[in-house]
């Protein structure tokens, strides 16, 4: 055949020969020769190799330290890390998920967009005209002001981002 | 063009003692590993034996292991088989055979030396 | 070691013909380390594949070969006058590297 410029696919050059990498999951004992083929062996327990490799050590599983809030959501195998996520009310700080912190409140004036998840913290919205947000909450939208019409009242205390629409009785007209 | 040129068959007794070598041209030897591959009149081809391209590793089949004895000179571009203890089943053309690039396949041949073992 | 089992022994076809041969291992060959050699009549074998499906150097495109673990095939899609002769895999995943014992292609 053609001298090759570069081995085939799941292939590594070592030696003048091209030698099979280990599957998932193993980790290689020894490089192929002119006359044996690659030696792997599979990973141990809590260990993993997620690719075709050549590599002589697998890597350790993802431990979820409980102590910073974490839990696992996926048990590694021994192809995949472990995957950890947050306790409830707590979310990742980090795409790798290293460590967690509480989710954060929206404050007064603010709302709700959208809650948080194990992975993204709280995403927060000024209270548009017309509604208002009078507690600090991880979970509140905001709520529209009261309409007094409909209760045959009238506002007697214009309503803030803060505060809700105060509504008093209709002044009578005396005939 | 690679060549290579098997030498030093014959009639031999059953007992005895043979040398066979293998001439090598059209190639740089020393970067291929090399082999030794026989084949019965009328039957199958069997895997003798085979060598590194340095000499370091050398690998047998059971059927001539302890008997047979493959080496290597590089400076000669030679590659040779000494055969003790000669049995009549050893009887065979022998094949030597280089490497093809980078794989564990045998892609040249030399035409063959017979040995005959017999009394 | 590893055994090699061919079949058929002997598989009987015109030229135009599709030819399948079949090569089984007692035990997984690792990584697809597998050849297929042709040997004719007086000569030496000739190399056709390599590591089970790559074709050697100046093999025509009609030879073919597949498979993985313990079940390999070599396959000649249309026989040429010149395709008749004896097959056999080798296998070199680990010394002792074995052979299996033949499949004759005949002309019917």
């Known amino acids: 055949p053609e001298p090759p410029t570069a081995c085939r696919e799941k292939q590594y050059l070592i030696n003048s020969q091209c030698c099979s990498l280990c599957q998932p999951g193993q980790k290689l004992v020894s490089d192929c020769t002119e006359f044996t083929e690659t030696e792997c062996l599979p990973c141990g327990e809590s260990e993993f190799l997620d690719t075709w490799n050549r590599e002589t050590h697998c890597h350790q599983h993802k431990y979820c330290d409980p102590n910073l809030g974490l839990r696992v959501q996926q048990k590694g195998t021994s192809e995949t890390d472990t995957i950890c996520t947050c306790e409830e009310g707590w979310h990742c700080t980090s795409e790798a998920c290293e460590s967690c912190v509480l989710h954060r409140s929206c404050s007064p004036g603010f709302g709700v967009k959208q809650i948080a998840t194990g992975v993204s913290d709280t995403i927060c919205e000024p209270c548009p005209v017309g509604f208002f947000s009078n507690v600090s909450s991880a979970f509140e939208k905001c709520h529209p002001w009261t309409s007094c019409e409909t209760k045959d009242l009238v506002v007697q205390q214009a309503g803030t981002n803060k505060t809700d629409v105060v509504c008093g009785p209709q002044d009578r007209l005396r005939a | 063009e690679v060549q290579l040129l098997e030498s030093g068959g014959g009639l031999v007794q059953p007992g005895g003692s043979l040398r066979l070598s293998c001439a090598a041209s059209g190639f740089t030897f020393s970067d291929y590993a090399m082999n030794w591959v026989r084949q019965a009149p009328g039957k199958g081809l069997e895997w003798v034996s085979g060598?590194?391209?340095?000499?370091?590793?050398?690998y047998y089949a059971d059927s001539v292991k302890g008997r047979f004895t493959i080496s290597r000179d590089n400076s000669k571009n030679t590659l040779y088989l000494q055969m003790n203890s000669l049995r009549a089943e050893d009887t065979a053309v022998y094949y030597c055979?280089?490497?093809?690039?980078?794989?564990?396949?045998?892609?040249?041949w030399g035409q063959g030396t017979l040995v005959t073992v017999s009394s | 070691e590893i055994v090699l089992t061919q079949s058929p022994g002997t598989l009987s076809l015109s030229p135009g013909e599709r030819a399948t041969l079949s090569c089984r291992a007692s035990q997984s060959v690792k990584n697809s380390s597998l050849a297929w050699y042709q040997q004719k009549p007086g000569q030496a074998p000739r190399l056709l594949i390599y590591?089970?499906?790559s074709r050697a150097t100046g093999i025509p495109d009609r030879f073919s070969g597949s498979g993985s673990g313990t079940d390999f095939t070599l396959t000649i899609s249309r026989l040429e006058p010149e395709d008749f002769a004896v097959y056999y895999c080798q296998q070199s995943s680990a010394p002792p590297w074995t052979f299996g014992q033949g499949t004759k292609v005949e002309i019917k």
């Open positions: 590591t089970a499906s």
């Open positions: 055979a280089k490497h093809v690039d980078f794989y564990r396949a045998l892609d040249y």
């Open positions: 060598i590194k391209s340095g000499g370091s590793s050398k």
